[in-house]
């Protein structure tokens, strides 16, 4: 969490802002949040990025102005215009590319003051992983795979019963680029699997973390997936 | 509330160049970005490029090397211009304005232009 | 180029009739897909964006769905005055692209 104050001639403003990750190719979210305004014909959002000449996007007397908006942002980011004047400042981005990574700050000017926190805002793939029963192998074998990654993660395996084992030497991880050729497919083949046990799969970069887990009794197969995204603090 | 009008011939003659006026009101060209789009007979629509509201314009890569989008902000204006007209290129040609500025959907249209180009 | 692919091509139902419009793309476009309906010697109106979103003033028996790669309209009562072209496109790359789009008659 960043809080940011303003220092003008005017009383200052508290900004917040939430470090957080962006999903290559889906849309990511900038957080911003200020002290709200009584008239939105008095707030005035600017989003800028470290080492971009133009602007973000910028938003004054109640509707976007985007003269100044910087070539690499066009036609992808829009603010939540109904909320701005409950003090929501947040940018939408479209299509997130690798290249949206960077230190952001969102200024702001109301009646009040002016202020401004800066984000950083990381990019990168991350996806569920799915844990299943491989039948085609011939002997007990789990395989998890996950469609998205980037930057290359880690795979490792972990057992409930046999807690702090190493498996790096009974599973086998590929990675297959995807075809954007960024982003990476995860497949990971565990072998020697024992019955009424539980196994996750774990799948880390510095982004994400993301875990899949298989429980196989001789009567079913219970799955569970979660994710995790990593460094997501406020300033 | 916001409105498209365009402006522009109904007739070309083979190998000419088309020229379109559209002219906004009820929203500013520095907000939101102009697109063009048109329609040959019993086709779908096909976009041909835009105009976003810094100036910078992308292109159909199909139609790159003979058009070009300009504008005056100051007169609200947004000037479509297509070199080296064919038969094919006979359509209805449209400009239109996004609902956000993300590009969602096409919310607002002009009244469409009828391109025949003939000798 | 995406390719957004609808269908069927033309289609005759009754009046009251729920109606199941599709549109697939070649590759994944998140849901930036907007349905569009053109009455004769008129432009295209928006009926629904961002895949799911009803735009101002359309009736809600139009309901849109999907994302990634496949997407629907669905009218769900049809009326006589629904009887007329529906086209999808897609915003997410570029060039942006629209299907051929559907015709839906009366029977």
């Known amino acids: 969490l960043i809080i940011g104050f303003g220092i003008s001639g005017r009383h200052s403003i508290t900004v917040t802002t939430v470090a957080s990750a962006g999903n290559i190719g889906e849309d990511g979210i900038l957080s911003c949040t200020f002290e709200p305004d009584i008239k939105l014909s008095d707030i005035v959002i600017q989003w800028l990025k470290e080492g971009v000449l133009g602007l973000v996007h910028e938003f004054k007397e109640g509707k976007d102005e985007l003269s100044e908006q910087d070539e690499m942002f066009r036609g992808r980011t829009a603010v939540f215009a109904d909320q701005v004047i409950v003090g929501n400042a947040s940018l939408r981005l479209k299509n997130v590319q690798l290249t949206d990574a960077g230190t952001y700050k969102c200024y702001i000017i109301t009646s009040k003051g002016k202020g401004n926190a800066n984000l950083e805002y990381k990019t990168g793939a991350f996806s569920m992983p799915e844990v299943n029963v491989d039948y085609n192998a011939s002997s007990e074998t789990l395989r998890c795979e996950a469609p998205r990654w980037f930057p290359q993660p880690t795979v490792v395996w972990a057992s409930q019963v046999d807690q702090g084992a190493n498996f790096s030497e009974v599973s086998n991880t590929s990675f297959e680029l995807n075809s954007e050729n960024v982003t990476m497919k995860v497949v990971s083949v565990l072998y020697n699997v024992t019955i009424n046990n539980t196994y996750s799969c774990m799948i880390e970069n510095d982004i994400a973390k993301a875990t899949g887990d298989i429980k196989v009794t001789e009567s079913e197969i219970k799955r569970r997936s979660h994710l995790q995204l990593l460094n997501s603090k406020a300033s | 509330q916001v409105q498209l009008q365009q402006s522009g011939p109904g007739l070309v003659q083979p190998s000419q160049s088309l020229s379109i006026t559209c002219t906004v009101s009820g929203f500013s060209l520095t907000s939101y970005g102009v697109h063009w789009v048109r329609q040959s007979p019993g086709k779908g629509l096909e976009w041909l490029g835009v105009?976003?509201?810094?100036?910078?314009?992308d292109y159909n890569a199909a139609f790159i090397s003979r058009l070009s989008i300009s504008k005056d902000n100051s007169k609200s204006q947004v000037f479509f211009k297509m070199n080296s007209l064919q038969a094919d290129d006979t359509a209805i040609y449209y400009c239109a304005r996004d609902i956000t500025t993300i590009v969602e959907g096409f919310a607002y249209w002009g009244q469409g232009t009828l391109v025949t180009v003939s000798a | 180029n995406i390719v957004m692919t609808q269908s069927p091509k033309s289609m005759s139902m009754s009046v009251g009739e729920r109606v199941t419009l599709s549109c697939k793309a070649s590759?994944?476009?998140?849901?930036?897909v907007s349905w569009y309906q053109q009455k004769p010697e008129q432009s295209p109106k928006l009926l629904i964006y961002?895949?799911?979103n009803r735009y101002t003033g359309v009736p809600d028996r139009f309901t849109g769905s999907g994302s990634a790669t496949d997407f629907t309209l669905t009218i769900s009562s049809v009326q006589a005055e629904d009887v007329t072209d529906y086209h999808c496109?897609?915003?997410?790359?570029?060039?942006?692209?629209f299907g051929s789009g559907t015709k839906l008659e009366i029977k």
């Open positions: 496109g897609q915003t997410y790359s570029y060039p942006f692209t």
């Open positions: 105009i976003w509201s810094g100036g910078s314009t």
């Open positions: 590759e994944n476009v998140g849901t930036y």
């Open positions: 961002g895949a799911s």
